[in-house]
Interface confidence: medium
């Protein structure tokens, strides 16, 4: 019985930590300006942006889009993982 109580407490504690962690990440991403500054995503080399795209306006909107995608992907990964875990845990009961 004590083990079950510990399990429930641990799960509740983990959920709280998960939510805090996700909140912190979101806050940090928002602070840095979600989709805000220029910059490529994974796989981009360290060449200057001017070299990568000659058209400044295109660079601007494309990079903004890339960054928004990166953030969405990240949040989906972080929050999605937790949602799946919650569903799994519910299924066990």
């Amino acid at each position: 019985r004590r083990d079950v109580a510990h399990g429930i407490l641990n799960e509740a504690y983990r959920k709280v930590l998960d939510q805090l962690s996700a909140g912190k990440h979101l806050q940090s991403l928002v602070a840095r300006g979600v989709g805000g500054s220029l910059g490529g995503g994974a796989g981009d080399d360290a060449e200057p942006l001017s070299k990568r795209h000659s058209d400044g306006i295109f660079t601007d909107s494309y990079s903004r889009y890339r960054k928004q995608m990166a953030v969405k992907k990240y949040l989906a990964a972080v929050l999605g993982k937790r949602y799946k875990q919650r569903v799994k845990n519910k299924g066990r009961r």
């Epitope: 912190k24 990440h25 806050q27 940090s28 602070a31 840095r32 300006g33 805000g36 500054s37 220029l38 910059g39 490529g40 995503g41 994974a42 601007d60 990079s63 903004r64 890339r66 960054k67 990166a70 953030v71 992907k73 990240y74």
Partner: antibody, heavy 115, light 110 residues
């Protein structure tokens, strides 16, 4: 990126430093302030993001204020003390999920606080 | 408070030799890789060398190499040149929306 406004001031005299940028837009980039006391290391002061929200180092809260226009970023020192004597640098703060970087720096502007 | 400890404070290297500078953080940097390295020469602003812990900035020679993750990072300069004489700083970027510089390492080239 170029800083201006650094000068000799007496303690308590408000001072505003200006960082002027060209070749990129402040509506898509965050800008950082970093300072360096004579003969000392670099010290991060804070940044203002592309949405005009300012974030400060824990030690800098209440002592400094950031603001910006379309081409300039200001750092206001409300009540300078002798400890604020330093060269102040403005730098472009770029980030992605995969990295963050201070990739473009101004030459710096020297602030001397002395009575 | 987060502390970013850089060692050694000063290091001497012979031309053609190798130098390693360590940067240890009391907490993990954001995303485990939000760590940059800068080179600064007297009277000049810092110059970005490495970002994302290991990505070489544009125009920086491949003699400079960054490695590490989480709390422990290293900058290695191989085939040291006279022009590499400078002070090097690491910079950690953290989830608490704070950036912290290491204390700096002076590299003297003999």
């Amino acid at each position: 990126v170029e800083e201006s406004g650094g000068r000799l001031v007496t303690p308590g005299t408000p001072l505003t430093l200006t960082c002027t940028v060209s070749g990129f837009s402040l509506s898509t980039y965050n800008m950082c302030w970093v300072r360096q006391a004579p003969g000392k290391g670099l010290e991060w002061v804070g940044f203002i993001n592309s949405d005009d929200s300012a974030y400060y180092a824990s030690w800098a809260k209440g002592r400094f204020t950031f603001s910006k226009t379309s081409t300039t970023v200001d750092l206001k020192i409300a009540s300078p003390t002798t400890e604020d004597t330093a060269t102040y640098f403005c730098a472009r703060y770029d980030w992605d999920y995969y990295y963050s970087r201070l990739d473009l720096w101004g030459p710096g502007t020297l602030v001397t606080v002395s009575s | 408070d987060i502390v970013l400890t850089q060692t050694p404070a000063s290091v001497s290297a012979a031309v053609g030799g190798t130098v390693s500078i360590s940067c240890q953080s009391s907490e993990s940097v954001y995303n485990n890789n939000y760590l940059s390295w800068f080179q600064q020469k007297p009277g000049q602003p810092p110059k970005l060398l490495i970002y994302g812990a290991s990505t070489l900035a544009s125009g920086v020679p491949s003699r400079f190499e960054g490695s590490g993750s989480g709390t422990q990072f290293t900058l290695t300069i191989s085939d040291v040149q006279c022009d590499d004489a400078a002070t090097y700083y690491c910079l950690g970027d953290y989830i608490i929306i704070e950036n912290i510089f290491g204390g700096g390492t002076e590299v003297v080239v003999k």
